[in-house]
Amino acid sequence: GSERTCCPVNWVEHERSCYWFSRSGKAWADADNYCRLEDAHLVVVTSWEEQKFVQHHIGPVNTWMGLHDQNGPWKWVDGTDYETGFKNWRPEQPDDWYGHGLGGGEDCAHFTDDGRWNDDVCQRPYRWVCETELDKASQEPPLL
């Protein structure tokens, strides 16, 4: 099939990507699976411009992104290089805090109420954002 030229219904197009913003919460792994079932991935933030776009749509609400360090180093779910890529952590974050009493540290990244990032317990039921590149959004042409 041909490349898609528009985003699915209820998704928002921005800079050749399609974004879906949840209005309910899930744990990070469940949100990740949700995006995968949509042929997408948790949002990968690669620029200040993309950060501002996402921040505008989610508002001041804790929201998962596709960044985690569950296997050691911080990794983006789509393979984007973390070390050389865009970052927007809150001061003194990530801190892998153990003081929450839930067991373990903090291995999943989310947007905080001011848009900057924090690491948190992956089981917390936060909202999330899915992203898919426009030319990967479907193998179908747009409906006429």
Epitope: P8, R36, S138, Q139, L143
Partner: antibody
Framework: EVQLLESGGGLVQPGGSLRLSCAAS????????MSWVRQAPGMGLEWVSA????????FYADSVKGRFTVSRDNSKNTLFLQMNSLRAEDTAVYYC???????????WGQGTLVTVSS | DIQMTQSPSSVSASVGDRVTITCRAS??????LAWFQQKPGRAPKLLIY???SLQSGVPSRFSGSGSGTDFTLTISSLQPEDFATYCC?????????FGHGTKVEVK
């Protein structure tokens, strides 16, 4: 009108294989994830598997993982469930379902009966 | 896996009655809950999704409520066509799981 029509069920011996099909119409098939759900005689519903619209991501219940494979042919608007190493406890009516908004199972086929018995 | 426990397993009621069915999740599923109706020999039919949203074409006498772990399906005034089995489903986490069902039968 959304229509889902399962086929391929029947009687098979333990250890045998069967391939179920689900022909879909009335919606843009490739844009929707799809699921298989089964119901043993007189029992409740059990989710079996799900597959994303382009087929790149699949999910399975532990009870069928490694034995069942879900796939799809978007050019033919058809969903498949390849069932291997079948057991008596796999006996059930198998339904295919369309995953709609937020992945809710909004349309179901009428089901096909799979009986695993010697 | 998340277990979904429905109660009662059956309820006897008359046309016009208000019927309430409950579903309890073994862990927090926020609002990722659906309700289905199934009649003998038929496929399940989606009634309610996201805990309280009414599926298109479903009569307004059906309503859903709850959050977290405790959920309710209410039929405000039972109609003859409502005698069936009702079950809940969570889609918060894989594997998606269903309740065992509540049969609404004629008193």
């Amino acid at each position: 009108e959304v229509q889902l029509l399962e086929s391929g069920g029947g009687l098979v011996q333990p250890g045998g294989s069967l391939r179920l099909s689900c022909a879909a119409s009335g919606f843009t098939f490739s844009r929707n994830a799809m699921s298989w759900v089964r119901q043993a005689p007189g029992m409740g519903l059990e989710w079996v598997s799900a597959i994303s619209g382009r087929g790149g991501n699949t999910f399975y219940a532990d009870s069928v993982k490694g034995r069942f494979t879900v796939s799809r042919d978007n050019s033919k608007n058809t969903l498949f469930l390849q069932m291997n190493s079948l057991r008596a406890e796999d006996t059930a009516v198998y339904y295919c379902a369309k995953n709609g908004r937020e992945q809710w199972l909004d349309y179901w086929g009428q089901g096909t009966l799979v009986t695993v018995s010697s | 896996d998340i277990q979904m426990t429905q109660s009662p397993s059956s309820v006897s009621a008359s046309v016009g009655d208000r019927v309430t069915i409950t579903c309890r999740a073994s862990q927090n599923i926020t609002n990722w809950l659906a309700w289905f109706q199934q009649k003998p020999g038929r496929a399940p039919k989606l009634l309610i999704y996201t805990t309280s949203s009414l599926q298109s074409g479903v009569p307004s006498r059906f309503s859903g409520s709850g959050s977290g772990t405790d959920f309710t399906l209410t039929i405000s005034s039972l109609q003859p066509e409502d005698f069936a089995t009702y079950c809940c489903q969570q889609t918060n986490s894989f594997p998606w799981t269903f309740g065992h069902g509540t049969k609404v039968e004629v008193k």
